[in-house]
Interface confidence: medium
């Protein structure tokens, strides 16, 4: 992946636009596709003014380790539908993208430098365990995904994209 | 229940300072949960966000980019209170200013929601 | 600067449903409020990150965010519902901007 191709705004407004295209075409998060069973995500609130005065190593292993979790619940959804009597369609193209996203998503940020932040010397402090929850249906997937997207990970690379600019 | 009360002029002259105060009950103005924030309403420019304080073990504020060569918010921990202060006013500056709080750490976007709101103060910048 | 953009004003008849639209760059990707405002009271906040209700507002209010538009839904509209709506977002690192604000008229 080119350099920094990430901090062009509309590359990462892509992949949310698209993580809520596919949060619209479950029929809403009350009567949309239930998963079979409960997929452990990671938590998307943001406390923007803590966030804020985080430092950039901090954020890179919220964003690194949610990253890492996501992919592995929508993994786990593909699983769950491929193991369902008839999938459908749409959702099963919806599940697809979200794991060649997360995939473009996660080369970026290794071009980024995020996987850098994450060498933390063995003096430091170990960061905080990450706040998950657990999810019942497709279209809360689908929202987690959107809101990871354009909560921690938008704030995230807004920072270091600004600080390379410097 | 969280409640602002907000007091002040409602006059001031051109190049003057606009001071207002907003006065907290039911939370606590250093809260580590809360945000405290500025917002004033004209005509012309419709509502307008101006800055924001908070207490995170320390004080922090953000101030809109409009407006920050001018603008202070400053807490007031013994009176449970925060101000705004805004220099060198013009008539352009006429508007009803609000005091409102916002609760960081909520659902995604509700740490920007401004939940509850004092009820204005009209000031006229006017010789 | 951002720009949210509203239409002046939106007209119902009272029990049909109301739809006000707040447009912006690409606002799909960010988090989007409501707020309702009487004449002579402050704004109250009636939609939060795009589609979620406070505690106190009816399930009527509701509200969806994609592309380039939000859009705030008041269902089985009453005559109390008429008051101007104004949406809003931090669009930005640290500004939050407002829509120009929408007029609601109930007619009859």
């Known amino acids: 992946a080119p350099p920094r191709l990430i901090c062009d705004s509309r590359v990462l407004e892509r992949y949310i636009l698209e993580a809520k295209e596919a949060e619209n075409v479950t029929m809403g998060c009350a009567e949309g596709p239930r998963l079979s069973e409960n997929i452990t995500v990671p938590d998307t609130k943001v406390n923007f003014y803590a966030w804020k005065r985080m430092e950039v190593e901090e954020q890179a292993i919220e964003v690194w380790q949610g990253l890492s979790l996501l992919s592995e619940a929508i993994l786990q959804a593909q699983a769950l539908l491929a193991n369902s009597s008839q999938p459908p369609e749409t959702l099963q193209l919806h599940i697809d993208k979200a794991i060649s996203g997360l995939r473009s998503l996660t080369s970026l940020l290794r071009v980024l430098g995020a996987q850098k932040e994450l060498m933390s010397p063995p003096d430091t402090t170990p960061p905080a365990p990450l706040r998950t929850l657990t999810v019942d249906t497709f279209c809360k997937l689908f929202r987690v995904y959107a809101n990871f997207l354009r909560g921690k990970l938008k704030l995230y690379t807004g920072e270091v994209c600004r600080r390379g600019d410097r | 229940q969280v409640q602002l009360q907000q007091s002040g002029p409602g006059l001031v002259k051109p190049s003057q300072t606009l001071s207002l105060t907003c006065a907290i009950s039911g939370d606590s103005v250093s809260s580590n949960t809360a945000a405290w924030n500025w917002i004033r309403q004209s005509p012309s420019r419709g509502l307008e966000w101006l800055g924001v304080i908070y207490y995170r073990s320390k004080w922090y504020n953000d101030y809109a980019v409009s407006v920050k060569s001018r603008i202070t918010i400053n807490p007031d921990t013994s009176k449970n209170q925060f101000s705004l202060q805004l220099n060198s006013v013009t008539p352009e500056d006429t508007a009803v200013y609000y005091c409102?709080?916002?609760?960081?750490?909520?659902?995604?976007?509700?740490?920007?929601?401004?939940?509850?709101w004092g009820r204005g103060t009209l000031v006229t910048v006017s010789s | 600067s951002y720009v949210l953009t509203q239409p002046p004003s939106v007209s119902v008849a009272p029990g049909k449903t109301a739809r006000i639209t707040c447009s912006g760059d690409n606002l799909g990707t960010y988090y989007v409020e409501w707020y309702q405002q009487k004449p002579g009271q402050a704004p109250v906040l009636v939609i939060y990150d795009d589609s979620d209700r406070p505690s106190g507002i009816p399930e009527r209010f509701s509200g969806s965010n994609s592309g380039n538009t939000a859009t705030l839904t008041i269902s089985r509209v009453e005559a109390g519902d008429e008051a101007d709506y104004y949406c809003a977002s931090f669009a930005s690192w640290s500004d939050s901007v407002f829509g120009g604000g929408t007029k609601l008229t109930v007619l009859g």
């Open positions: 409102a709080r916002s609760v960081p750490g909520g659902d995604p976007g509700l740490e920007h929601a401004f939940a509850y």
